[in-house]
């Protein structure tokens, strides 16, 4: 029996009968055997073929065979109802080999011209299965020359049996309060040769409960407990299953925070599996009960592990830990069902006793001392000395526990001294200086420091002076002995201030003119004002209006008297303005150089002289009357004059105020 | 984590101010809870001077009140301490600290009122 | 205001005793106590606030319990590391007090 060709030859060639194309002899008996590689099939098909018709051919055949499988009986030239012929069939061998068994009996009727055939190895496309017939692969197949192979979706290993595909379905830790878990692919059939397993792992203090829902169905056995596939459920204390069937299993109530659960498949069977719903309990809180004037959030039926609640109070009412307080109250239940912390109280807010307000008191208006939410008390400034600046006294205790004006603000209102009060009435005409009474002058302040110098009180705590005044303590402030609240230059009995800083202005240059000769002294503390210590007011915009020309105006001081000392007791003088060219001109002349008078000074005093500042009151006011508002006002301060005061043609030069009213309200704001 | 650290001088003279200042951080000191200063005289005990609270309200120790302000300054996180006209009975280690559910204090700084 | 009054004002047990301090208010503080510890040239520490509740980091042997004015610090299994100062304090009303310390040692 000749031998096809073998792999790994070239797999094709021709088959003929005995003798072809001529007739074949009697008596005949061929075989080939034809081998393809692994993973490869053979196809042959005729391209002649005349052999004698028989009886499901007895007699002459060509018999195809796989295996043991007889794949075709073939003779005669066209197929009958009994008999075939291979006419344009291709015939493929069942794996890789093929035999082909040619036999003639001892006769023939007539001639027969036998066959020919052509064969070839090709691949076998293992991913085609007929219906019916289980699939190659679980999930993809793909083909290649001489072989196939499988794959897997993702979420999916191949098994080592290389077709199937097992679930990759361990690992999964739950650690929600409730969730569910199912079989893989639920609630379509679960894969094969799978072992999954899932964790519910809780804080400590829960426990799981486990509900298995919608359906049940993993493959089952009638006489054996769960064979095949099955889920177990596995607890520190105990193991529930395992499980299959088609019932729903009881559930379960774990009494454990951490559960494991085991589903395990064979090769076999088409089932959809299970589906849990999980949830899980804790020993319950005591129920909150809100504060007073509180409420508890959210409200729920019951409070377990790791459940809060917030406490909020009432609007006027605060959140206190006895007498701590607090923005936000969170308690939380922990596992021995016991809160985090104790309850807390919603106290009625309470804005405490009010500040004490200088140069001012405070009444209580809801009641003797109430200061809770909502109570109402006013503030007022000392009369007649002091005035209330910006609002109007009264404060609530608001919710955030301030007291709080009208206008919203938390600061305490302010008591501003009463500026320009003077008992001093004045007379309409100019007469000779005159020792001052008490309450005339109370705005002026003696300093020494070195030399005597005087200044005015501004607001209370601020003095206006003469830059020459006080040039040499400029960097010394607390040398200057600041005396007021006296008529006597040497009286024991005055109220004391001392200086925290000199401020005299950049303008001023020292022995060289007087142009800019004014300063301030800040006081380190504020002084108490009275009928003897009150401010001078500075000049409103309108105030030139009562310094013109011949407009009356008041010096004081305890300056040089005509008797050439130091007066003893507080004097004043009443003078006139002089008009500006009149007063540079009687400067132009020696010994003084030109432009010694300039725009920033004024003028005052009598052409007949007489009258007059002098030296040590260096630095005082000059004062005017403002006719509408019934205050005093600083016009001028004292600053330079003739070598002989009160001569005639001379006249007393004052440092203009007017014009440094921005000067002194930055110092002032800024410091 | 929540950091308190004291900070001012070591010496301070008879009659003058003690300033002290506690910085904050890991936590804002408008969020919550009241911020306090605590002193410990050397061998002795612990003292509670006064709090701020979140919402800038202060509250002081009777007898203190008169000499003490707390305040802060809520762009630094910080709260303040000032005790003026101080003695040497106020010579002690100064803590600041909040308490109650939030229990910080910083290490400690000691002030000497010596001349 | 409201003094707090410490027994015993130092004590001395053995590693492994169970160890009380006792805390007395002149009134009512409610459950608003708290207890610290302070070792030498260190800050106080809080072990316990309202009266019974732990911090969060101390060890289960510190407990705490009462409320009005009888209040108890315990430390069921006294370690070496306890040797400290012992501060009970009130925060029910303003001002805020301490006990006057307790000293524990090691025998």
């Known amino acids: 029996t000749p031998l096809g060709p073998k792999w790994p030859e070239p797999v094709f060639g021709r088959l003929a009968s005995p003798g072809f194309p001529g007739e074949y002899a009697n008596d005949q008996e061929r075989r080939w055997t034809l081998t393809a590689p692994p993973g490869y099939r053979l196809r042959l098909y005729f391209t002649h073929f005349d052999l004698e018709l028989s009886h499901l051919c007895e007699y002459d055949f060509v018999k195809l065979s796989s295996g043991a499988k007889v794949l075709a009986t073939l003779c005669g030239q066209e197929s009958t109802d009994t008999e075939r012929a291979p006419g344009k069939d291709t015939f493929y061998s069942l794996g890789s080999s093929l035999d082909i068994t040619f036999r003639s009996d001892y006769s023939n009727e007539k001639p027969f011209t036998g066959f020919e055939a052509f064969y070839a190895a090709e691949d076998i496309d293992e991913c085609q299965v007929a219906p019916g017939e289980a699939p190659t692969c679980d999930h993809h197949c793909h083909n290649h020359l001489g072989g196939f192979y499988c794959s897997c979706r993702a979420g999916y290993v191949l098994h080592r049996n290389k077709r199937t595909c097992s679930a990759l379905c361990s690992g999964q830790v739950f650690t929600q309060r409730s969730g569910e878990l199912s079989s893989p692919e639920y609630p379509r059939p679960y894969p094969k040769l799978s072992s999954c397993t899932y964790s519910i792992s809780l804080e400590e203090g829960f426990s799981v409960i486990l509900d298995f829902v919608e359906s049940f169905d993993v493959e089952t056995h009638p006489e054996t407990l769960c064979p095949y596939d099955f889920l177990k459920i596995q607890t520190d204390r105990e193991e529930h299953g395992p499980f299959c069937g088609k019932t729903l299993p009881h559930r379960i109530e774990t009494k454990s925070n951490t559960v494991t659960i085991t589903f395990v498949t064979d090769e076999s069977g088409d089932h959809t599996g299970w589906k849990i719903h999980y949830t899980s309990t804790a020993q319950p809180c005591p129920y909150p009960m809100a504060p007073p004037n509180g409420h508890v959030s959210p409200v729920q039926a019951k409070y377990i592990l790791k459940d809060s609640f917030s406490i909020f109070c009432e609007t006027g009412y605060e959140l206190l830990q006895g007498h701590l307080p607090l923005k936000s109250f969170t308690a939380v239940c922990q596992k021995d069902g016991s809160w985090d912390r104790p309850m807390p109280a919603c106290s009625i807010v309470d804005c405490g006793p009010p500040d004490d307000l200088p140069s001012g008191r405070v009444e209580y208006i809801t009641g003797p001392g109430v200061t809770t939410y909502k109570a109402v008390i006013q503030y007022s400034c000392e009369e007649t000395f002091y005035t209330m600046k910006v609002n109007d006294g009264k404060y609530v205790c608001e919710a955030d526990g301030f007291w709080t004006s009208s206008k919203g603000e938390k600061s305490l209102p302010v008591c501003e001294p009463v500026c320009g009060l003077s008992a001093r009435t004045t007379g309409g005409r100019i007469y000779g200086g005159q020792k001052a009474k008490p309450g005339d002058f109370p705005w002026q302040v003696l300093i020494l420091g070195g030399t005597t110098a005087a200044g005015a009180l501004l607001y209370d705590n601020w003095v206006l002076t003469a830059a020459h005044a006080v040039y040499e303590q400029k960097h010394d402030a607390s040398a200057l002995d600041i005396r007021m609240g006296t008529l006597k230059r040497l009286s024991p009995h005055y109220t004391q201030a001392w200086s925290e800083a000199v401020f005299i202005h950049e303008g001023y240059t020292h022995d060289a003119g007087f142009d800019n000769d004014i300063a301030l002294i800040k006081l380190n503390n504020k002084v108490v004002i009275n009928s003897n210590i009150t401010p001078i007011c500075l000049p409103r915009k309108e105030a030139e209006s009562f310094m013109r020309t011949d407009d009356i105006g008041t010096a004081s001081g305890w300056g040089l008297t005509q008797r050439g000392f130091l007066a003893r007791n507080l004097m004043y003088v009443d003078i006139p303005i002089v008009d500006h060219q009149k007063c540079t001109a009687a400067y132009e002349k020696p010994p003084y150089p030109r432009g010694s008078v300039t725009a920033n000074m004024l003028c005052a005093g009598l052409e007949s002289g007489g009258k007059d500042s002098c030296r040590g009151d260096s630095g005082g006011a000059l004062v005017f009357l403002d006719s509408e508002t019934e205050r005093w006002f600083v016009g001028g301060i004292v600053s330079w004059g003739s070598m002989n005061c009160g001569e005639a043609g001379q006249y007393g030069v004052y440092t203009k105020v007017i014009n440094y009213i921005p000067w002194i309200e930055n110092i002032i704001s800024d410091f | 984590e929540v950091q308190l650290q004291e900070s001012g001088p070591g010496l301070v003279k008879p009659s003058q101010t003690l300033s002290l200042t506690c910085t904050v951080s890991g936590y804002s000191i408008t969020s919550d809870y009241a911020w306090n200063w605590i002193r410990q005289p050397p061998g002795k005990g612990l003292e509670w001077i006064g709090y701020i609270s979140y919402s800038g309200r202060t509250s002081y120790n009777p007898s203190l009140k008169s000499r003490v302000t707390i305040s802060r300054d809520t762009s630094k996180n910080q709260f303040s301490l000032k005790l003026s006209s101080v003695t040497a009975a106020d010579t002690a280690v100064y803590y600041c600290?909040?308490?109650?559910?939030?229990?910080?204090w910083g290490q400690g700084t000691t002030v000497t009122v010596s001349s | 205001d409201i003094q707090m009054t410490q027994s015993p004002s130092s004590l001395s047990a053995s590693v492994g005793d169970r160890v009380t301090i006792t805390c007395k208010a002149s009134q009512n503080v409610d459950t608003n106590v708290a207890w610290y510890q302070q070792k030498p040239g260190k800050s106080p520490k809080a072990l316990i606030y309202?009266?019974?509740y732990r911090y969060s980091g101390v060890p289960s042997r510190f407990s705490g319990s009462g409320s009005g004015t009888d209040f108890t610090l315990t430390i069921s299994s006294l370690q070496p590391e306890d040797v400290a100062e012992y501060y009970c304090?009130?925060?029910?009303?303003?001002?805020?007090?301490f006990g006057q310390g307790t000293k524990l040692e090691i025998k």
């Open positions: 309202s009266a019974s």
């Open positions: 304090q009130q925060y029910n009303s303003n001002p805020l007090t």
């Open positions: 600290a909040v308490l109650y559910a939030l229990d910080y």
